[in-house]
């Protein structure tokens, strides 16, 4: 019995004065608590307590489930306990079935004995399995069996408590260990897509999987910058033991302008949080915009190839696409697809292949594109360079030497003079009167240009060169003078 | 005996946080796990979530998750259920219930939220 | 998660006769033979009552007309001889694996 200093409170004193007492089954159990300030007897097994106000407790009969702590507590809040075994050869065990572990933790296996002589107080596999290699534990009679540091792999592990009782093995009844698992990283959380575009009244639904050890991982969605709480609905899996899915879907049945955002999918569980997110982008209605990926004005020379091309960005997508030319479409020379294979691709691109171009072909080709909200056109202006062709030559009445060329860009014509029978003309000859012919017609196409000269001005043989020539390249018509006295006898024209 | 007195009925506006409370004994308070059961008026029993013995984990239903949290205060023997963010159907009695040997042994008295306007 | 089916929603039995109520579960609850399934009985304005425990143990204090079998998916809750203080609605409730569930409850009457 404890002893303290006379003046001092004292703890209340038991009878018997034992630590532990053990009685039959069916014997009567009597301990007396003496204090002059006795408050209440307490009574404790497998953690649950009864209680009595008298300071004499006396079970007449007792039995198994009457083994535990009995602890007098007197006015000063002082205690002392006893511990008393009900042997029961029948019950050697007090359970409590419930039997969860902690990853990494230890457990207690509540199995406390009802006898202390047994031996060989230990754990064992049901069935006769042999407990895991690494399975760690201490006995202790009166509370049972304490696992330590509990594996993921004990998970459902069947166990029973066994003692030795006259040399034969005794098992407990069943226990199931259920292990929940340390978190040992952060969730891992993906999003099906990272963003959208809708138009408004349409539907916006987002799906966030989550990815651990358990169901107890925390997830929600956010809005950016917003504390508003987001209407989510779930779904999970468990794919066999610690491989936890949930899918939590964000919905707004009628997305508007103002629900454009970023939306935050956050995780988190003991261990750390992770998060992904999507954007989310609501047009008041569907749009087209056109971007040329060459200049909208093209020149090509005569007889080659061109590739008109554009991207464009549609939402919703397109439906009609066409490339036009002076009022006909084209049924083929053209390709269109979208620019990537991603589900939310809103950019195309469309190409037309213009091959060998006639300078015949120049014009405006448009590309017109539609879907159920908009139409868009673009166009390009195709300018075929030509080499300058000269149309006419000729003397005129009033005795003017005339060249007419055409060609794109529009042609210069010189005039050169060569004496007597040379074809290497040198000096120029200013011409009288320059026009271009066609400036108030059609802006595509070869432009014509016509010059003419004072043929008066020659005194002598000789050859009159009439050049045209442009960017693309030259052709020269020539007029031959041959002089019988005073007379031009006459003018012979070739090119 | 263990016993387990649940707070008082609780009247909420939507939108609103209720925090019920559970104060037990007759046992170790520490030493079980504590779960949260609730029942819509005429409907059946429908499980929230559980406080674990020992170190406080918890594990909720999946329809609760974000929105219920289960704590213990180790020194009044006191668990607590807090459901935010109420609704017209959060209308229900709300249990505690003490696990014991794999069954719910012993339960609250029971709490009844009211969600109006 | 879980799902627990309970059959019949509602039961009128004679006083005297047989009650019984069944309850599957959509994957088994049992582990190495135990089977984590429970019955429990409600009262209007009380709060349930454990009846049966694991499937066929008979809780301390419940009369011994109540009895549970089965094992797997398939369990059975029956009372040999119905009783007046026996009307109430009875549930079915699984703790194999978190969630916890119950059945959807049979209210039990008399004919």
């Known amino acids: 019995q404890p002893s303290v200093s006379p003046g001092e409170p004292s703890p209340p004193s038991i009878h018997p004065g034992k630590s532990d007492l053990i009685v039959r089954v069916g014997d009567e159990i009597r301990l007396l608590c003496t204090d002059p300030g006795f408050v209440k007897w307490t009574f404790e097994i497998l953690d649950e307590t009864n209680e009595n106000k008298q300071n004499e407790w006396i079970t007449e009969k007792a039995e198994a489930t009457n083994t535990g702590k009995y602890t007098c507590t007197n006015k000063h809040g002082l205690s002392n306990s006893i511990y008393v075994f009900v042997r029961d050869p029948a019950k050697l065990f007090l359970v409590d079935r419930s039997l969860y572990g902690k990853e990494d933790n230890d457990t207690l296996v509540r199995c406390p004995l009802t006898d202390p002589e047994v031996t060989n107080y230990s754990l064992k596999g049901c069935q006769g399995k042999p407990l895991p290699k690494d399975l760690r534990f201490i006995p202790d009679p009166k509370a049972g069996i304490m696992i330590k540091s509990v594996k993921r792999a004990y998970h459902r592990l069947c166990l029973h408590c066994s003692v030795d009782q006259e040399g034969k093995s005794v098992l407990s009844e069943k226990f199931i260990l259920k292990v929940r698992p340390a978190f040992k990283a952060v969730p891992v959380v993906s999003v099906s897509k990272a963003s959208y575009l809708l138009r408004e009244g349409e539907e916006f639904t987002v799906t966030c999987t989550i990815k651990d050890v358990s169901s107890s991982v925390y997830s929600t969605w956010k809005r950016e910058n917003s504390q508003t709480k987001l209407q989510e609905k779930y779904n999970s899996w468990h794919h066999g033991d610690f491989n936890y899915e949930r899918q939590a879907t964000l919905t707004i049945s009628s997305a508007r302008v103002n629900d454009s955002g970023v939306f935050m999918c956050y995780a988190n569980n003991t261990f750390g949080s992770a998060n992904v997110t999507t954007t989310l982008e609501v047009v008041d209605k569907g749009f087209i915009n056109i971007f040329p990926m060459i200049n909208t004005t093209v020149f090509v020379n005569d007889g080659e190839n061109v590739d008109l091309i554009v991207e464009y960005e549609a939402f919703p997508k397109p439906e009609h696409q066409q490339w036009i030319y002076m009022n006909r479409t084209f049924t083929d020379k053209w390709e269109d697809y979208p620019k990537s294979e991603n589900e939310s691709n809103i950019r195309y691109v469309s190409e037309l292949h213009l091959t060998r171009l006639k300078g015949t072909e120049g014009g405006t080709y448009t590309f017109l594109v539609s879907n159920s909200d908009v139409n868009a056109a673009i166009a390009f202006n195709v300018y075929v360079n030509t080499k300058p062709e000269i149309l006419t030559y000729d003397r005129l009445v009033n005795g003017m030497l005339q060249c007419v060329a055409a060609g794109f860009p529009e042609p210069t014509i010189d005039w050169y003079f060569c004496p007597g029978t040379e074809q290497r003309c040198s000096a120029s000859v200013l011409p009288v009167d320059v026009q271009t012919l066609n400036s108030s017609g059609p802006p595509f196409g070869k432009l014509v240009v016509q010059s003419s000269i004072d043929s008066s001005a020659f005194k002598h043989n000789g050859t009159v060169e009439c050049k045209a020539y442009n960017d693309v390249g030259k052709t020269s018509a020539y007029f031959n003078f041959a002089f019988k006295g005073n007379n031009k006898e006459q003018i012979h024209p070739h090119t | 005996q263990v016993q387990l007195v649940q707070s008082g009925a609780e009247v909420k506006k939507p939108g609103a946080s209720v925090k019920v409370s559970c104060k037990a004994s007759g046992y170790t308070f520490t030493s079980y796990n504590m779960h949260w059961v609730r029942q819509a008026p005429g409907q059946g029993l429908e499980w929230m979530g559980v406080?674990?013995?020992?170190?406080?984990?918890?594990s909720y239903a999946q329809k609760f998750q974000g929105r219920v949290t289960i704590t213990a205060d180790k020194s009044t023997s006191t668990a607590y259920m807090e459901l935010s963010s109420l609704r017209s159907e959060d209308t229900a009695v709300y249990y505690c219930?003490?696990?014991?040997?794999?069954?719910?042994?012993?339960w609250g008295q029971g709490t009844l939220v009211t969600v109006s306007s | 998660d879980i799902v627990m089916t309970q059959s019949p929603d509602s039961l009128a039995v004679s006083l005297g006769e047989r009650a019984t109520i069944n309850c599957r579960a959509s994957e088994s609850v049992d582990i190495y033979g135990q089977s984590f399934m429970h019955w429990y009985q409600q009262k209007p304005g009380q709060p349930p009552k454990l009846l049966i425990y694991l499937a066929s143990n008979l809780e301390s204090g419940v009369p011994d007309r109540f009895s549970g079998s089965g094992s797997g998916t398939d369990f059975t809750l029956t009372i040999s001889s119905l009783q007046a203080e026996d009307v109430a609605v009875y549930y079915c409730q699984q703790n194999n694996e978190d969630p916890y569930t119950f059945g959807g409850g049979t209210k039990v009457e008399i004919k």
């Open positions: 406080i674990y013995s020992g170190n406080g984990d918890t």
């Open positions: 219930a003490r696990e014991r040997d794999t069954r719910f042994g012993n």
